[in-house]
Interface confidence: low
């Protein structure tokens, strides 16, 4: 940083004078103020003041024409110093070298160069490299070595020496600070490029300075208060969008926000996100706020964005109140699930239960209920109190509703807000079991032959549980025990029936009593078909014939 | 079988009430919820409430809450409708409407009245 | 409040053809979705309900289908006393029952 090229100076120069050839610069300028001196023959010592140097800005100046046959070569010293007279840098060495006359101009490589730099970048800062070239002879003289200045910077905020150029690489580098993207997006520099490293013949092109923008500036709430209003029990529910501004590149990093609820969610009932487009905070519930249990939430929420500050910035912070509106909630039957037992086959109005709901809702409201399913049409219920009474038969046998001796019933609560809403509930009945059902044989149609009898055995079924079922006595009735028997094995689930007398080719009803354990009659009309044949028989052959 | 006959046409000036009935048969009359659904002329069908005939409880359409209210007598097996504050677009064809009972939570309606027309001008 | 829309409002049919209705809600009724006739002077009469059960009574060429928020009525082969409006109803969510404004089914 502190070194600089020999500076070529051609012989005869016309000035005017003092003529700026070079300017010292020492990185150290970031930190405190710097002085710039020379020293040596043509500048303190003889040829006295040939040179000079600005000492604030660091321009070497030429102050009259050089004459390269009296001197071809000059040796200085540049010295930075503090204010307080400190040497900042060790000296350097300044050598000027008096080049032969030139007539050929340089040519820059394009018309137009494009860099770029972040905004905010410390003054040494490089951004880019421009490139001339000059026909004239570089090898013995100085008359093809091109010398970089700029020769003007378009806008000049905020202030016109922003860029420097390396005068022999033709570096543009940051100069000084204060690149503010925001303010100045872009700088337009004439850039010159002079032969005889500097004082030849000169052209002119254009490089053009993008400054890229940097997180400088925080996202900003506008406005920084406010109020919404949520129904109560909403998921999801969109409470506010908040706004931001941010003066930083749209759609960057450094624009993009980042929302951050920092208090208020006690209960973590609500969420933040960005929308993509808009930038806004999108606060949503992420749980249903409760109206009985606090009907207003106050919540500080904090922007900043994807991209880190590149330096300490203050956060900007919303409060948002957000109010909890009251909702007609729905009623809760309590159990959800209710289970009772009930015998089955109780007398018509008898009542099952009581089957009521809770409103959550503070204010005391009607609740009316009705039976939604009542697949049997078996129960009714009343509107206002809930109770459950028998409107028809509740049958435990009944294979098509009941299951596991279970009756499911589902009924409805409706309260009278506006609108109403309804909650259900389910009414397990367990129907204990009653003797209502007396034993059944089976089958009920038999085939048997008039000769040699094969005993017909009957299975004996019951719908009743134990034990109000085996074991079973059977009897016949209607003079049917003339010609038959009926027994009960001993484990007393079938029953033997027997033709005990000859009977003709015919169909006769035989009729059977089977009583339970519980002395549950029930009367059974067998088919029986008898025919012309000996012993075991499924269907009748042809008449029979005797011999 | 099941009957709903309702009672005859109305003409009625701006301001007045009308109250329709609506007998039923057939059936067993507290065993089924009624609705009431109107029709303007050339219009669609618009529901307005519905009345439990066993105790009597009622819900009405938003549109109409404040202007009908729905009652039943028992011991006739009869449903009414009041609408009162009529203005002429009352003017409609007032139909009662049985809900059935399924398994389903609410009910399509399997039988309608014949229709009685309100008409409401000065 | 549940809406249903119906498709299309007026249907030209020749008799013997085949009449496709369509009636659409606004959210999703699950099945519970009913179809009434009604003729001019006359009072709507059950077609469907569940979706897709016939009435009692009802002629096996009216044939309901769908289930969520699209449901289709299906005429077979359309007779002379087929000409009529016909609605279609939830009852899925209530109050309030709500109807489709209805389609005009005319002859061609």
């Known amino acids: 940083d502190w070194v600089v090229a020999p500076i070529s100076v051609p012989e005869n120069g016309k000035g005017p004078f003092p003529q700026r050839l070079n300017q010292l610069k020492s990185n150290k300028d970031r930190d405190t103020k710097i002085f710039y001196s020379i020293t040596g023959p043509g500048a303190d010592s003889p040829p006295e003041g040939v040179f000079a140097v600005e000492k604030e800005t660091g321009w070497l100046l030429l102050n009259k024409p050089l004459d390269r046959e009296e001197i071809a070569k000059y040796e200085l010293f540049g010295h930075a110093v503090s204010e307080n007279g400190a040497s900042v840098e060790d000296p350097m060495n300044i050598s000027i070298i008096v080049t032969d006359q030139n007539d050929h101009k340089p040519k820059f490589t394009q018309d137009t160069f494009r860099g770029s730099v972040l905004e905010g970048v410390l003054p040494g800062t490089s951004v880019m490299q421009v490139t001339a070239t000059d026909e004239d002879d570089a090898i013995y003289t100085y008359n093809g070595v091109v010398a970089y200045s700029i020769h003007s910077q378009e806008p000049k905020d905020p202030h016109d020496l922003m860029f420097t150029i390396h005068r022999s690489t033709g570096t543009i580098s940051v100069i000084s600070s204060g690149l503010d993207r925001e303010k100045v997006p872009e700088y337009t520099l004439t850039i010159q490029a002079t032969d005889m490293d500097g004082d030849g013949s000169t052209t002119t092109a254009v490089a053009v300075v993008e400054i890229l923008d940097a997180n400088d500036n925080a996202p900003m709430f506008d406005p920084q208060k406010y109020e919404a209003h949520v129904p109560e029990n909403a998921v999801g529910h969109e409470v506010q969008r908040l706004t931001v501004t941010d003066l930083d590149a749209p759609n960057s990093p450094a624009w993009r926000a980042t929302y951050l609820i920092m208090g208020g969610d006690d209960g973590d009932h609500f969420t933040i996100t960005t929308h993509p487009e808009s930038n806004q905070g999108i606060l949503t519930t992420r749980k249903g706020l409760d109206f009985e249990a606090k009907n207003q939430h106050t919540l500080y929420v904090e922007v900043t964005n994807e991209a880190p500050f590149v330096l300490k910035l203050p956060t900007s912070t919303a409060t948002i109140v957000v109010h909890v509106e009251d909702v007609n909630e729905a009623p809760v039957f309590v159990p959800p699930s209710k289970v009772v037992e009930v015998q089955e086959g109780i007398p018509t109005g008898e009542p099952v239960c009581v089957y009521t709901a809770e409103d959550p809702d503070k204010e005391n409201q009607k609740i009316s209920y009705r039976i939604l399913r009542d697949p049997a049409g078996w129960l009714a219920m009343d509107p206002d109190s809930g109770q459950v009474t028998a409107v028809g038969t509740l049958d435990r046998e009944d294979e098509q509703f009941v299951r596991n001796n279970i009756y499911e019933v589902m009924v409805l609560a409706m309260d009278n807000g506006s609108p109403p809403t309804t909650g259900t509930g389910t009414l397990l009945l367990t129907l204990i079991d009653v003797n209502d059902h007396g034993p059944v044989p089976e089958p009920r149609q038999i085939t048997i032959c008039n000769q040699s009898p094969v005993r017909q055995v009957l299975n004996i079924t019951d719908k009743d549980l134990s034990p109000h079922t085996s074991p079973f006595q059977a009897q016949l009735t209607d003079d049917s025990d003339i010609y038959w028997t009926a027994e009960v094995n001993e484990e007393g689930d079938t029953v033997v029936l027997s033709l005990k007398k000859f009977l003709k080719q015919d169909t006769y009803d035989v009729h059977l009593s089977l009583s339970d354990h519980g002395n549950k009659e029930q009367l059974t009309v067998i088919r029986a078909t008898v025919c012309d044949c000996h012993g075991h028989v499924e269907t009748c052959p042809g008449p029979w014939k005797g011999g | 079988q099941v009957q709903l006959v309702q009672s005859g046409a109305e003409v009625k000036k701006p301001g007045a009430s009308v109250k329709v009935s609506c007998k039923a048969s057939?059936?067993?009359?507290?065993?089924?919820?009624m609705h009431w659904v109107r029709q303007a002329p050339g219009q669609g069908l618009e529901w307005m409430g519905i009345i439990n005939p066993s105790g009597g409880s009622t819900s009405y359409a938003q549109k109409f809450q404040g202007r009908v209210t729905m009652t039943r007598d028992t011991s006739t097996s009869t449903v009414y409708m009041e609408l009162s504050s009529l203005r002429s677009e009352d003017t409609a064809v007032y139909y009662c409407?049985?809900?059935?009972?399924?398994?389903?939570?609410?009910?399509?309606?399997?039988?309608w009245g014949q229709g009685t027309l309100v008409t409401v001008s000065s | 409040e549940i809406v249903m829309t119906q498709s299309p409002a007026t249907l030209s049919v020749s008799p013997g053809e085949r009449a496709t209705l369509s009636c659409r809600a606004s959210?999703?009724?699950?099945?519970?979705l009913a179809w009434y006739q009604q003729k001019p002077g006359q009072a709507p009469r059950l077609l469907i309900y569940g979706a897709s059960t016939r009435a009692t009574g009802i002629p096996a060429r009216f044939s309901g289908s769908g289930s969520g928020t699209e449901f289709t009525l299906t005429i077979s082969s359309l007779q002379s006393e087929d000409f009529a409006v016909y609605y279609c109803q939830q009852y899925n969510n209530w109050p309030p029952w709500t109807f489709g404004q209805g389609t005009k089914v005319e002859i061609k």
């Open positions: 057939g059936y067993t009359f507290t065993s089924y919820y």
């Open positions: 959210q999703s009724v699950s099945s519970n």
């Open positions: 409407a049985r809900e059935g009972y399924s398994s389903s939570w609410y009910d399509y309606f399997d039988y």
